[in-house]
């Protein structure tokens, strides 16, 4: 095959090699970019910046090598369009630093940075951590910081992500109130900060205020839906990102719902209770307090993380006709109380007769177990918990 005269030449089925001295100053408009899985670039001293737009359209790229070139700067979002990138070799360039954001979101198996005039500062704390943790083949490179020494020796005591403190109101918050939250950000080299409010939806009207180092957030006209919803403050510096989530408790009165009893492993009278703070519960049976036992007890389902409503069952272990009746669930919190009732019938009464009527007794003369003409008692597996006096 004739030698390829272009700046970049195909290599294998989905690779491209760009090795002609000084032919590139950017990676725009590479031929066949959308199908490339491998890109090898060498001796491109004019290629000094790698930015978001350079790798747009290279969605299949897995291996990127830019070596012995003039690369001085890689943008934090440079690899946004190459999520499949697993090997990145940027050795023997002019890189002094590389942001933690550049590799965030990638699953790099290999990151090669040797031969760059790296400069040690907190901005390389993430890379030092990779070295400590044996990630990406970094330890084998024994990276040096230009003018200083091994990256491994860089002091890191002051290299922390931002510290966040979110102040929430101490006082009780009621439906319809306006709530002011403040996020205090501390730390060196603060770059960006903000709020994540994706869970809030229609729970309140949101107004943001202020900026670093103190961010304000007003939640106006809050609803009870705000409960259990995360309000997250985040901040970034050259070391990394920190997030702190808080929840605002909006007080509202207890409410309760009961549903028809269903037979499962045990019988279950399903219920739902809501309220903030969480209401206390009490069951009544036919108007009297029901004391729970190992046969009759309240069981809650696993609560949903983002809502106050609790679902559960009054569990009844093999109930009989004596458990038939009216069940009432009382729920109360400081802001109100509620109740709901339901009739439950688990079993017909096998002794449904008038006490004045004669009691029918069956004799079984063929029963060999019976040594006399006494009535044979058939023991039912279900304990009735009731005694019948025969007069």
């Amino acid at each position: 095959a004739a030698p390829c005269p272009d700046a970049c030449c195909p290599h294998g089925s989905s690779g491209l090699r760009c090795t002609r001295d000084g032919a590139l100053d950017s990676l725009h408009h590479l031929p066949g970019a959308e199908n490339l899985t491998e890109l090898y670039i060498e001796n491109q001293q004019h290629l000094q910046h790698l930015e978001l737009r350079d790798l747009r359209g290279l969605g299949e790229l897995r291996n990127l090598t830019i070596v012995k070139s003039g690369l001085r700067f890689v943008a934090p979002d440079a690899f946004h369009f190459t999520p499949r990138l697993s090997r990145l070799n940027l050795s023997f360039n002019a890189l002094e630093s590389l942001s933690w954001k550049t590799v965030q979101g990638l699953s790099l198996q290999e990151l090669v940075l040797s031969g760059n005039p790296l400069h040690c500062s907190c901005a390389l704390r993430w890379l030092q951590r990779w070295e400590e943790e044996g990630l990406g083949g970094v330890p084998e490179q024994k990276l040096q910081c230009h003018g200083q020494g091994p990256l491994a020796h860089m002091p890191n005591a002051s290299c922390g992500v931002p510290t966040l403190k979110v102040q929430v109101p101490n006082a009780s918050v009621d439906v319809g109130d306006d709530v002011l939250l403040r996020c205090q950000v501390e730390g060196r080299g603060l770059e960006q900060a903000g709020w994540i409010l994706t869970e809030l939806e229609q729970s309140a009207t949101v107004m943001k205020s202020g900026g670093l180092p103190s961010l304000g957030l007003t939640l106006a006209n809050v609803t009870s839906d705000l409960n259990r919803k995360n309000v997250t403050c985040w901040a970034e510096n050259d070391v990394g990102r920190a997030e702190v989530s808080v929840q605002v408790n909006v007080s509202f009165p207890a409410s309760v719902q009961l549903h028809t009893a269903v037979e499962m492993h045990h019988w279950c009278i399903p219920f739902s209770v809501d309220g903030q703070p969480a209401p206390s519960l009490r069951w009544l049976f036919n108007g009297s307090v029901l004391n729970e036992t190992s046969f009759i007890f309240t069981e809650f389902l696993e609560p949903a993380a983002n809502e106050t409503v609790r679902h559960g069952c009054l569990r009844l272990n093999q109930p009989t006709h004596v458990n038939n009746g009216n069940y009432t669930l009382l729920a109360a919190n400081p802001f109100g109380q509620a109740s709901a009732s339901i009739m439950a019938a688990f079993m017909d009464n096998p002794f449904e007769f008038n006490p004045e009527d004669p009691i029918p007794v069956s004799f079984s003369p063929v029963d060999t177990n019976s040594t006399s003409g006494d009535p044979v008692e058939k023991k039912d597996e279900t304990p009735f918990g009731v005694s019948v006096a025969v007069g």
Partner: antibody
Framework: QVQLVQSGAEVKKPGASVKVSCKAS????????MHWVRQAPGQGLEWIGT????????SYAQKFQGRVTLTRDTSTSTAYMELSSLRSEDTAVYYC????????????WGQGTTVTVSS | DIQMTQSPSSLSASVGDRVTITCRAS?????LYWFQQKPGKAPKPLIY???SLGSGVPSRFSGSGSGTDYTLTISSLQPEDFATYYC?????????FGGGTKVEIK
């Protein structure tokens, strides 16, 4: 103990060059970056550049790029700083200093070499 | 380049006084160094990465700060402490020094 001993004072004419030496002892010369810093009379400290004796890697301050050359001789554990096209404002005391990576600072300094540029 | 601004540029104090020198960086830095220099001598390292005492440095010297604002404190000034003090950053190339603070006898 660790020591850096510099060459003696120099008087030069404008346009000439000067080469200052810095002999290291008491440690492995090739393992630590050597830096050069200068101080004009009555002024503050100004960084010139650095060399890694292990492989001759260098970095220079933008201001001195093209005029300064840092070299080393590992056989004698000596670092050199050569400054060309001298002008009167290059009159200063020139220091070599080792960057001690174990504690991450310039821990040992030479005694200084006075370079006077005068016609 | 990151600019380092020291204040005051000079101060007069008596033996036993508590002395505070501040250094402000033009942008946030990772850590700071302090040097002491006496006339005709090379700078002597006092404090490295912000608050660690250099070898043989008396405990009356202390350093603190973060971000852009840093402080060198001498808790009880001694006769041998009369000198010029320099701060230095190396968060990014090139390393830069403050203009110096001369501590003189009152």
């Amino acid at each position: 103990q660790v020591q850096l001993v510099q060459s003696g004072a120099e008087v030069k004419k404008p346009g000439a060059s000067v080469k200052v030496s810095c002999k290291a002892s008491g440690y492995t010369f090739t393992e630590y970056w050597m830096h050069w810093v200068r101080q004009a009379p009555g002024q503050g400290l100004e960084w010139i550049g650095t060399i890694y004796p292990g492989n001759s890697d260098t970095s220079y301050a933008q201001k001195f790029q093209g005029r300064v050359t840092l070299t080393r001789d590992t056989s004698t554990s000596t670092a050199y700083m050569e400054l060309s096209s001298l002008r009167s404002e290059d009159t200063a005391v020139y220091y070599c200093t080792r960057f001690y990576f174990e504690d991450w600072y310039f821990d040992v300094w030479g005694q200084g070499t006075t370079v006077t540029v005068s016609s | 380049d990151i600019q380092m601004t020291q204040s005051p540029s000079s101060l007069s104090a008596s033996v036993g006084d508590r002395v505070t020198i501040t250094c402000r960086a033009s942008s946030s830095i990772s850590w700071l160094y302090w040097f002491q220099q006496k006339p005709g001598k090379a700078p002597k390292p006092l404090i490295y990465y912000t608050s660690s005492l250099g070898s043989g440095v008396p405990s009356r010297f202390s350093g603190s700060g973060s971000g852009t604002d840093y402080t060198l404190t001498i808790s009880s000034l001694q006769p041998e402490d009369f000198a010029t003090y320099y701060c230095q950053q190396w968060h990014s190339y090139p390393p830069t020094f403050g203009g110096g603070t001369k501590v003189e006898i009152k």
